[in-house]
């Protein structure tokens, strides 16, 4: 039994890391791997993490981490019974993939603007929490062509646009997903989307 | 409110022992990394021992090793550190404190401190 | 045992004044850096853990920054009671290490 990938691993910065390997044939992860994972600090405890099955060959550990900060390194060590097949480390504030907003939703009763909102998906304590900015992506469920993304550079999870930039009486579809330049994150996964039907009043013509 | 007491200092023979005590209340002592941090007459501060949550693994500076022993009651919600063949460079004030994470790192509580005299 | 250089040693100043305090590892440390502060008579008190985050309930004009090697400490604008003596302390190399403290006076 030999790794075929070696693991790489990102953190959410909260309290989960995921960790993904590919072994070179056939493995039922949870019975016969086990991946370790220890600060480098003093009397730091040692945890054990039972991998799941992601495709024939592929692993996938989900790692429970409290109150991750900038210094914390971890030594990974993947075992097969009592054989050691990998030894690594990881440095959480250098692989940093941000949680997904949640909660997105589209005011329609602001005069002719749109104002769309979400939760930032970390609490005020965490660090990530005052360093993230958003991009919303709004498109058509009836062109495809229709498809538009808003960089939101600001810290306030909000954007407001004028109904009369999209078209009137279509249905359209907004998702956010977030990331932090402070740790050069990856971006996060996209939240899950929110459906409304555009219809603003056009403005009287002048003749 | 958080607060650890530490008792049990004084003046001591040289060679002699002593035992320092630190209560901890209004937070949960059970979970909690502590650990003895001294500081000398000239100021300087010094990680003494440390110790894990249940007491199964502990740390000490190589200039106490053998002679100090960190231990704790949690039934009791204390924090216990018995020094012997004391030497007159252990003369300092000795804080009780809390590990801010589960491993030696920043200390976010501290005691007031308990002064010990180790003369000839 | 690594080695903790904080300098100056003492520090006059004024009120509203920036202070900035700085520490030297004598090898890599990463960001496992603490800054304490002790007020006369009294014990050390958390400000800063892993380099640059600002404990619970610490005022914003503290702030501290750095990695690897070199440290820094800032105050923006000092006030009163921010008489005392500042303490750096390294966890990343056994044993752990203090720097000899920065006493900041105010003229």
């Known amino acids: 039994m030999k790794v075929l990938q070696e693991p790489t691993c990102v953190s959410d910065y909260m309290s989960i890391s995921t960790c993904e390997w590919k072994m070179n044939g056939p493995t039922n992860c949870s019975t016969e791997l086990r991946l370790l994972y220890q600060l480098v600090f003093l009397l730091s405890e040692a945890h054990t993490c039972i991998p799941e099955n992601n495709g024939g060959a592929g692993c996938v550990c989900h790692l429970l981490m409290d109150d991750v900060v900038s210094a914390d390194n971890y030594t990974l060590d993947l075992w097969a019974g009592q054989q050691l097949l990998w030894k690594g480390s990881f440095k959480p504030s250098e692989h940093v993939k941000p949680r997904a907003p949640g909660n997105l939703t589209v005011h329609t009763n602001v005069s002719d603007t749109l104002l769309l909102t979400w939760s930032n998906p970390y609490p005020p304590d965490n660090y990530l929490y005052n360093h993230l900015t958003y991009a919303v992506n709004i498109w058509s469920e009836n062109d495809p062509a229709d498809f538009r993304i808003y960089n939101v550079t600001y810290l306030e999870p909000s954007l407001r646009i004028a109904a009369s930039t999209l078209k009137s009486g279509i249905s359209y579809r907004a998702r956010v997903r977030a990331w932090a330049q402070c740790y050069n994150t990856t971006w996060s996964e996209w939240s899950p989307s929110t459906k409304w039907h555009n219809s603003y009043r056009e403005p009287f013509e002048q003749h | 409110d958080v607060q650890l007491v530490e008792s049990g200092g004084g003046l001591v023979q040289l060679g002699g022992s002593l035992r320092l005590s630190c209560a901890a209340s209004g937070f949960t002592f059970s979970s909690s990394y502590m650990s003895w941090v001294r500081q000398t007459p000239e100021k300087r501060l010094e990680l003494v021992a440390a110790i894990n949550s249940n007491g199964g693994k502990t740390y000490y500076a190589d200039s106490v090793k053998g002679r100090f022993t960190i231990s704790r009651d949690n039934s009791k919600n204390t924090l216990y550190l018995q020094m012997s063949s004391l030497r007159a460079e252990d003369t300092a004030v000795y804080y009780c404190?809390?590990?801010?994470?589960?491993?030696?790192?920043?200390?976010?509580?501290w005691g007031q401190g308990t002064s010990v005299t180790v003369s000839s | 045992d690594i080695q903790m250089t904080q300098s100056p040693s003492s520090l006059s100043t004024s009120v509203g004044d920036r202070v900035t305090i700085t520490c030297k590892a004598s090898q890599d440390v990463s960001t496992a850096v603490v800054w304490y502060q002790q007020k006369p008579g009294k014990s050390p008190k958390l400000l800063i853990y892993?380099?640059?985050y600002r404990y619970t309930g610490v005022p914003s004009r503290f702030s501290g920054s750095g990695s690897g090697t070199d440290f820094t400490f800032t105050i923006s604008s000092v006030q009163p009671e921010d008489i005392a003596t500042y303490y750096c302390?390294?966890?990343?190399?056994?044993?752990?290490?203090f720097g000899g403290g920065t006493k900041l006076e105010i003229k």
């Open positions: 404190t809390r590990q801010r994470g589960n491993y030696v790192g920043a200390m976010d509580y």
């Open positions: 302390h390294q966890y990343y190399g056994s044993p752990p290490t």
């Open positions: 892993s380099a640059s």
